[in-house]
Amino acid sequence: KEEQTTFRDCAEIFKSGLTTSGIYTLTFPNSTEEIKAYCDMEAGGGGWTIIQRREDGSVDFQRTWKEYKVGFGNPSGEYWLGNEFVSQLTNQQRYVLKIHLKDWEGNEAYSLYEHFYLSSEELNYRIHLKGLTGTAGKISSISQPGNDFSTKDGDNDKCICKCSQMLTGGWWFDACGPSNLNGMYYPQRQNTNKFNGIKWYYWKGSGYSLKATTMMIRPADF
């Protein structure tokens, strides 16, 4: 059997025998275009493709539509993998989405969606989610049904004013909705009563800005 040299996601890399967490090169489905991603090969059985990470405020997440499309930041630290790659990948087969959260008091929680995909750019990378489980709230903090993605220069929300400008960051804003993991990063003791922080309402409430977040995906049949 010929050795696989290109990989669509971290699950394929894991199955090929590369089981160390780190940065790997992924290839777009049906293309030779490449993208660098962080693969978590330890958590929950491994094979997770990290599509978002916040941990220290080192990267500015108030970015343009194009930047959210192609990705930005550093896969070894804070980054956004890119809506176009995630859209193409999650329309190839069924993926699960796991969102791992940390607060400033040492607590951790997660939300796991058993089916996740993003629509195409023509449909504003609308998020589609089904089947929530986990410890970060019994109700989804990503509004259901899913919303279109919005950025500071691409306003697709349901608010009378622009959520991305007000709350900062690109996200699937509703009006503006119970979450924004791409909001402003606030350090400890400055992280409460924040209008525009890193928010996951059904775990920590409206004004609490989180310490760390990771969004990761993996094929449902892994």
Epitope: C159, I160, C161, K162, C163, Q165, M166, L167, D174, A175, C176, G177, P178, N193, F195, N196, K199, Y201, S206, G207
Partner: antibody
Framework: QVQLVESGGGVVQPGRSLRLSCAAS????????MHWGRQAPGKGLEWVAV????????YYVDSVKGRFTISRDNSKNTLYLQMNSLRAEDTAVYYC????????????????WGQGTLVTVSS | EIVLTQSPGTLSLSPGERATLSCRAS???????LAWYQQKPGQAPRLLIC???SWATGIPDRFSGSGSGTDFTLTISRLEPEDFAVYYC?????????FGQGTRLEIK
């Protein structure tokens, strides 16, 4: 469409009480913090009170603290303002208003506003 | 509390002219958390601008907001007859929420 309709205003003597209501429709009431504001005749706008979407948090302007109580009944999509120990300076048109952003409570812009209900405190 | 001072108190202009309304804060408004409202006689206020410069849905683009820190401006590029009203600024940067005293825009 989003609609807010206030009721309960009227003429009342100083020291007496009045309860205002605001019936909300056209949006998910439970997702939004709600406010009361007021406008004395011929004067400007003044913020009075806010209640969070879940009813757990309430804040008031200093001039009404201890006299006014904001509350809500999410099962009835209704906001209330209980006004006790009324004074002549409380005479105003009282407006209820929805916060501009859902799942947030406190500091926000307002949209929309109701049409207002007039409260006159006079002996 | 943050005190907002609007100027001028009254502005007399003709349709077609440009109107510039000022709102000055007693201390810096973080995050440009400032809104503008229009109020006509016997009506409730109507949101025009939030976040200092973002148009509310359905507001004509002849209205524009600008500014940061302590100085904010509402500009109406070309006055229409329906624009003559009272305009209020409001800050939601710190508690309590406060409004300016208003600017009356009247027909000259």
């Amino acid at each position: 469409q989003v609609q807010l309709v206030e009721s309960g205003g009227g003429v009342v003597q100083p020291g007496r009480s009045l309860r205002l209501s605001c019936a909300a429709s056209g949006f998910t009431f439970t997702n939004y913090g709600m406010h009361w504001g007021r406008q004395a005749p011929g004067k400007g706008l003044e913020w009075v009170a806010v209640i969070s979407h879940d009813g757990n948090n309430k804040y008031y302007v200093d001039s009404v603290k201890g006299r006014f109580t904001i509350s809500r009944d999410n099962s009835k999509n209704t906001l209330y303002l209980q006004m006790n120990s009324l004074r002549a300076e409380d005479t105003a048109v009282y407006y209820c208003a929805r916060e501009g952003i859902d799942f947030w409570s406190g500091l926000n812009w307002f949209d929309p506003w109701g049409q207002g209900t007039l409260v006159t405190v006079s002996s | 509390e943050i005190v907002l001072t609007q100027s001028p108190g009254t502005l007399s202009l003709s349709p077609g002219e440009r109107a510039t309304l000022s709102c000055r804060a007693s201390q810096s408004i973080t995050g440009s958390y400032l809104a503008w409202y229009q109020q006509k006689p016997g009506q409730a206020p109507r949101l025009l601008i939030c976040g200092a410069s973002s148009w509310a849905t359905g507001i004509p683009d002849r209205f524009s907001g600008s500014g940061s820190g302590t100085d904010f401006t509402l500009t109406i590029s070309r006055l229409e007859p329906e624009d003559f009203a009272v305009y209020y600024c409001q800050q939601y940067s710190s508690s309590p929420i406060t409004f300016g005293q208003g600017t009356r825009l009247e027909i000259k």
